[in-house]
Amino acid sequence: EQAPGTAPCSRGSSWSADLDKCMDCASCRARPHSDFCQGCAAAPPAPFRLLWP
């Protein structure tokens, strides 16, 4: 949940309590376990070569 008193994150981003800022949901493909990814609708799977080069 976003910290009280902070502006809502823009579309395609989600609040990270760990980093104390809005983060791009697109980065959840690379960092799926980041706290802010819970606030993103769906983290697309990484392409095969990115996960298993």
Partner: antibody, heavy 119, light 111 residues
Framework: EVKLEESGGGLVQPGGSMKLSCVAS????????MSWVRQSPEKGLEWLAE??????????HYAESVKGKFTISRDDSKSRLYLQMNNLRAENTGIYYC??????????WGQGTTLTVSS | DIVLTQSPASLTVSLGQRATISCRAS??????????MQWYQQRPGQPPKLLIK???NLDSGVPARFSGSGSGTDFTLNIHPVEEEDAATYYC?????????FGGGTKLEIK
């Protein structure tokens, strides 16, 4: 203030080795993917190697051109990144940048260190 | 490897006008939701600086006169209105897969 400072560049003969270092400050080093990027007039910007996090078992990835020749490593306790380069050739000449990114982009860049491979 | 082709190689734009730089990828770097394309600015004697990530998202501290668009294989960086300090070389970079690659650069001059 974020700072990345490379060192270890210089002149080396073909076939020689060199180890580059980068010391980081101003951000949570152990939470950032780190990479080395080279720039040369001939090939422009080239991503060379990446090392991920402790939680990723420090997974490494390399460009095909340096695989088996270069080794990337990190020491989170010292906020340091390294690049061991062996069997250097003239085409390895360039400016080597230490870069850091939260994910698959490069947020932070050092000023670069120049490597010249020449006899 | 994915090849990124930038155009034009160089351009000159009058102060206050619009600069448009294109980057074409040899294959799609987009999902249905996101595009894995970044833009960087490099001033002479300086390292590159991240401007835009994931095709459209301005990095913190980057002026709103910079904008990115595109998906699939075709991406665009727009600068409007152009200021003197924007004279630099601009690079695109994909993060669709390993290896990451960069475009050849576009040199922007201001008149």
């Amino acid at each position: 203030e974020v700072k990345l400072e490379e060192s270890g560049g210089g002149l080396v003969q073909p076939g020689g080795s060199m180890k580059l270092s980068c010391v980081a400050s101003g951000f949570t080093f152990n939470n950032y993917w780190m990479s080395w990027v080279r720039q040369s007039p001939e090939k422009g910007l080239e991503w060379l190697a990446e090392i991920r996090l402790k939680s990723d078992n420090y997974a490494t990835h390399y460009a095909e051109s340096v695989k088996g020749k270069f080794t990337i490593s990190r020491d989170d306790s010292k906020s340091r990144l390294y690049l061991q380069m062996n069997n250097l050739r003239a085409e390895n000449t360039g400016i080597y940048y230490c870069t850091g990114g939260f994910a698959d982009y490069f947020d932070y860049w050092g000023q670069g260190t120049t490597l010249t491979v020449s006899s | 490897d994915i090849v990124l082709t930038q155009s034009p190689a160089s351009l000159t734009v009058s102060l206050g006008q619009r600069a448009t730089i294109s980057c074409r990828a040899s294959q799609s770097v987009s999902t249905s939701s996101y595009s894995y394309m970044q833009w960087y600015q490099q001033r002479p004697g300086q390292p590159p600086k991240l401007l835009i990530k994931y095709a459209t998202n301005l990095d913190s501290g980057v002026p709103a006169r910079f904008s990115g668009s595109g998906s699939g294989t075709d991406f665009t960086l727009n600068i409007h209105p152009v200021e003197e300090e924007d004279a630099a070389t601009y690079y695109c970079q994909h993060s669709w897969e390993i290896p990451y690659t960069f475009g050849g650069g576009t040199k922007l001059e201001i008149k």
